[in-house]
Interface confidence: medium
């Protein structure tokens, strides 16, 4: 038994043009969640299968609101580790899926909005009890930086957390300070004690008395950030014991190659030799296969049988994107004619037609006057998707059924008196005024 731990360092726009400013729109505040799913690495299960090794969810991130015009700050991330406990042996090779989700806060039509911003997947080799492994993954325009490790929970030990070491009350053949291990009585294991003072956050050891540093830290006890380290030798060796990193313009400084790639200097820059399953300038692209289940929304994964061959997602109707992760906005094609309102219901496309039009795409122009009679000698006028009656004098209303009082609206200005007449209305103007409506 043990725990897989994932630490998210940063999530934000990746390098290059076209990268978004921030995951939040300027309109609404939002917060992020991270979700991790683990599966035994050699399993052929698709992403839709349960996370056989376990899954975890980060705490809710702090609420973030983008300030228009202000420089984009580092996005506030959820606190703490994502921890996935495992009960059985650690498989050594595992597949992971890490999803970054955004929750938009505030009132909006259709309810709160959730978005899957990024989804990265990969397969890794990892021994339990080893140091933190660092990784950078890109998904579309986003970049996710994280570290992970697997550690055994006592009394389990070993690279797969399968050996049990329990101190026994009976005398043992193990020397002083050594623990007897079950099930092999004659196997003795020393408790791993790092060098005294070795930083618990930035250092680790694989041998007793050792202090090895995580990337970005140096010094005998791994307490010095590399940017502030000072070396006596101008180009001394990179070493956790001397606390020196090679300074200066060396393009391989700090090893820009991710995922265990090895860096070699070239006359102009550097070159990464990537391990199997990774590619890209810095070995940052993981060889995701169909076994990692990269296709969303019922997409069919083809090819990608091994990490060195690409996969293709064949998307079902209504979805697009390299992983079928985007819903096609079918309304953007403006399928509704004659000013109809388009409704994409997911399972179907509907058009809400304006009055006077019908059909699945509002393609039929109805005869607005069909079956519509205008009373009292009125005539029907078709147009604008609705029928209208042009009424004879003295009548009004939608169907000319109402007797019209032409004086009801008090049309005579400046105190003029209104008289209804068969041909319309007549204004008798007050002294000093003239005109059809006494307007002058």
């Amino acid at each position: 038994a043990g725990v897989f731990e994932l630490q998210i360092h940063s999530f934000g726009p990746g390098p290059g043009p076209g990268a978004p400013r921030s995951p939040c729109s300027a309109r609404l505040p939002c917060r992020l969640f991270f979700r991790v799913c683990l599966k035994p690495g050699l399993s052929e299960e698709a992403a839709e299968s349960p996370c056989a090794l376990g899954a975890a969810l980060s705490a809710r991130g702090p609420v973030y609101t983008e300030q228009p015009g202000a420089p984009a700050p580092d996005l506030p991330l959820p606190d703490g580790l994502l921890q996935v406990p495992f009960r059985d042996a650690w498989p050594g090779t595992f597949s992971f899926i890490i999803e970054t989700w955004r929750e938009e806060l505030g009132d909006q039509i259709g309810g709160p909005a959730w978005s899957l911003l990024a989804r990265v997947a990969g397969r890794r080799r990892l021994a339990a009890g080893g140091p933190w492994a660092r990784d950078i993954q890109r998904a579309g325009a986003w970049e996710l930086r994280f570290s992970y490790r697997a550690r055994c929970e006592p009394p389990a030990v070993g690279t797969a957390c399968t050996r049990l070491c329990r101190p026994r009350s009976a005398p043992s053949r193990c020397g002083p300070g050594l623990r007897p291990c079950a099930p092999l009585e004659d196997e003795c294991e020393a408790p791993l004690v790092c060098r005294a003072g070795c930083s618990p956050e930035h250092g680790f050891c694989e041998q007793p008395g050792e202090c090895r540093c995580l990337e970005g830290w140096t010094g005998p006890l791994c307490t010095v950030p590399v940017s502030t380290s000072s070396c006596l030798s101008p180009r001394g060796p990179s070493s956790a014991t001397t606390g020196c990193l090679v300074p200066g313009p060396g393009p391989c400084d700090g090893n820009p190659c991710a995922n265990g790639g090895s860096c070699s200097e070239t006359p102009r820059s550097f070159e990464c030799t990537c391990p199997r399953g990774f590619y890209g300038l810095r070995c940052e692209v993981s060889g995701v296969t169909c076994a990692d289940g990269p296709c969303f929304n019922g997409g069919l994964c083809v090819g990608g049988a091994d990490p060195d061959s690409a996969y293709i997602c064949h998307c079902p109707p209504g979805f697009q994107g390299s992983n079928c992760e985007k819903r096609v906005d079918r309304c953007s094609l403006q399928p509704c004619r004659n000013g109809g309102l388009c409704l994409d219901l997911g399972h179907a496309l509907r058009c809400r037609c304006r009055a006077g039009f019908a059909g699945p795409r509002c393609e039929h122009d109805l005869d607005d006057c069909a079956g519509r009679a205008c009373a009292n000698g009125g005539t029907c006028v078709e147009g604008g998707g609705a029928h209208r009656c042009s009424c004879a004098l003295g009548f009004g209303g939608r169907d000319c059924r109402e007797r019209a009082d032409p004086c009801a609206a008090r049309p005579c200005a400046h105190g003029g008196r209104c008289y209804a007449h068969f041909s319309g209305l007549v204004c008798a103007c007050a002294p000093g005024y003239m005109g059809a409506r006494c307007e002058f």
């Epitope: 969640f33 979700r35 799913c37 698709a46 992403a47 839709e48 299968s49 349960p50 996370c51 899954a55 969810l57 999803e99 929750e103 909006q108 039509i109 259709g110 309810g111 709160p112 909005a113 959730w114 978005s115 899957l116 989804r119 969303f296 929304n297 019922g298 209504g318 994107g321 992760e325 985007k326 819903r327 409704l343 994409d344 219901l345 997911g346 399972h347």
Partner: nanobody, 126 residues
């Protein structure tokens, strides 16, 4: 694919209660959102309540807040809608729907849900 089967509908007097169930089968890992929607005769389908299945976050239409509760049993891949203090205007066909991971999911917008059940009728008489 995801298959959804609703049950629990029926007729009830105003002020009464009903509990709807929706059992999901198939590729349920990707059903990150499960919700209940309803459609009364001659009206548009509208969101009632939705659950973000992996964070236990919920959203309710204003008309049902305080009366309806959405919940889930993860082990059974089932989502429930407990409806209390029912009113005649709650009469409608109730549909269970699921949405997979997507670019954008508005929790009460039927257009953002890809998978739908056949529906179960709820009738509230005064």
């Amino acid at each position: 694919q995801v298959r959804l089967v609703e049950s629990g509908g029926g007729s009830v007097q105003a002020g009464g209660s009903l509990r709807l169930s929706c059992a999901a089968s198939g590729s349920t890992y990707s059903t990150n959102f499960m919700g209940w929607f309803r459609q009364a005769p001659g009206k548009e389908r509208e969101g009632v309540a939705t659950l973000v299945t992996w964070v236990e976050r919920t959203a309710y239409a204003d008309s049902v807040k305080g009366r309806f509760t959405i919940s889930q049993d993860r082990a059974k891949n089932t989502v429930y809608l407990q409806m209390n203090s029912l009113k005649p205007e709650d009469t409608a066909m109730y549909y269970c729907a699921a949405a997979a991971a997507s670019t954008d999911v508005r929790l009460l917008d039927p257009g953002d849900f890809a998978y739908w059940g056949q529906g179960t009728q709820v009738t509230v008489s005064s």
